[in-house]
């Protein structure tokens, strides 16, 4: 090998990285409350609703500071891919009957597999431990009726809203040890 | 720019050790996992191992795995692998890199034999 | 014997296209881990082409593209020059290993 010529940089340095993720994480997040907003203006919500295929939330925010970055990122990563599951899930089992937001809940889907992307690089360049996704669960079964459809989406859409809450708090607070 | 300087490489004898370093300058050297990749004269890339940005994780190839230690010191910018009871098929341009790996140094050849 | 798999050799004349696939497992590419892709032209270090399967880095022209699916990935270089005769190496994350792994490199010649 000859004399070290030196590269150019070619990729963002990791504090960067986390920079533009935190915006990722902050743009899907207003992304789902106007979604919510949306569906509970279409289809009126009685009270809470809950699936037991998601994934319970990850952590309290005031239980953050005790975190360590790796089982930040890697429970984060594995919520997110659920509930990306959930939403190819929702499209495909409601297509017609949530046609009205099927514009923002496909953008939503995109963005929401560009952040898991961003985030498996980040951990990639910090070198942290990445731990293989959950064995695939088995396909979720499809809603009993429009309505148990409905409920579901305001159960996904609730849920990944306060996910991507408890991430961008998360991620500032690792942006400051890094 | 971007640098990795690779350095300690030679000649040395089976059962032997040596201790490889990597001076990496041009970026926040802290804020990434390093690597050594090595590759065999004619062959391909052989993934050695790696480093987190804080030096808590270290993981190894099985072909190294008891007998090589990765290090880094973030206050020095440096990166380091020690190397002992060296055999043939140890032989290879080691080199050093940087995140996914984005960065790679120009190498330095390690040769095992008696 | 290289963990992901990758044809030795490819060839194309200027102003082809080429593809040149990497094939693995459940445990890497199959795991949901990103695939990268390395340029390594004679005698030199390598360099990162492509990352996050079809990410490039600043400086990487157009003519390079990466994609994924399944166990598998592919690199596509269009307008195929003579400087683009090199080894190209795909790697990805291994969670048995709890580390990346490469294929074993494919020559490409420019005909």
């Known amino acids: 090998p000859g004399p070290p010529p030196g590269s150019p940089r070619a990729s963002p340095d990791p504090r960067a990285e986390l920079d533009s993720t935190v915006l990722l994480t902050r743009s899907l997040l207003e992304d789902t409350r106007q979604l919510t907003i949306q569906l509970k203006d279409k289809f009126p919500a009685d009270g809470d609703h809950n699936l037991d295929s998601l994934p319970t939330l990850a952590m309290s925010a005031g239980a953050l500071g005790a975190l360590q970055l790796p089982s930040v990122l890697t429970r984060l990563r594995a919520d997110l891919l659920s509930y990306l599951r959930h939403v190819q899930w929702l499209r495909r089992a409601m297509g017609s009957s949530l046609k009205t937001l099927e514009p923002e809940l496909g953008t939503l889907q995109t963005r929401l597999d560009r952040l898991l992307r961003r985030l498996q690089l980040l951990m990639s360049r910090l070198a942290l431990p990445q731990l293989p996704p959950d064995p695939p669960a088995p396909p979720l079964a499809p809603p009993s009726s429009t309505w148990g459809g409905i409920r579901a989406a305001h159960a996904i859409l609730g849920g990944l809203h306060l996910t991507l809450d408890w991430a961008v708090r998360g991620l500032l607070l690792l942006k400051t040890r890094l | 720019e971007v640098q990795l300087l690779e350095s300690g490489g030679g000649l040395v004898q089976p059962g032997g050790s040596l201790r490889l370093s990597c001076a990496a300058s041009?970026?926040?050297?802290?804020?990434?996992?390093m690597h050594w990749v090595r590759q065999a004269p004619g062959k391909g890339l052989e993934w050695v191992a790696v480093?987190?940005?804080?030096?808590?994780?270290?993981y190894y190839a099985d072909s190294v795995k008891g007998r090589f230690t990765i290090s880094r010191d973030n206050s020095k910018n440096t990166l380091y692998l020690q190397m002992n009871s060296l055999r043939a098929e140890d032989t290879a341009v080691y080199y050093c890199?940087?995140?996914?790996?984005?960065?790679w140094g120009q190498g330095t050849l390690v040769t095992v034999s008696s | 014997q290289s963990v992901l798999t990758q044809p030795p050799s490819a060839s194309g004349t200027p102003g082809q296209r080429v593809t040149i696939s990497c094939s693995g497992s459940?445990?890497?590419?199959?795991?949901?881990?990103?695939v990268h892709w390395y340029q390594q032209l004679p005698g030199t270090a390598p360099k990162l082409l492509i990352y996050?399967?079809?990410e490039r880095p600043s400086g990487v022209p157009d003519r390079f593209s990466g994609s994924k699916s399944g166990t598998s990935a592919s690199l596509a270089i269009s307008g195929l020059r003579s400087e683009d005769e090199a080894d190209y190496y795909c790697?990805?994350?291994?969670?048995?290993?709890?580390?990346?792994?490469f294929g074993g490199g494919t020559k490409l010649t420019v005909l």
């Open positions: 480093i987190s940005y804080d030096g808590s994780y270290k």
């Open positions: 890199a940087a995140g996914v790996p984005d960065y």
């Open positions: 041009g970026f926040t050297f802290s804020s990434y996992g």
């Open positions: 996050s399967n079809n």
């Open positions: 459940s445990s890497n590419i199959g795991s949901d881990y990103d």
């Open positions: 790697s990805a994350w291994d969670s048995s290993l709890s580390g990346p792994v």
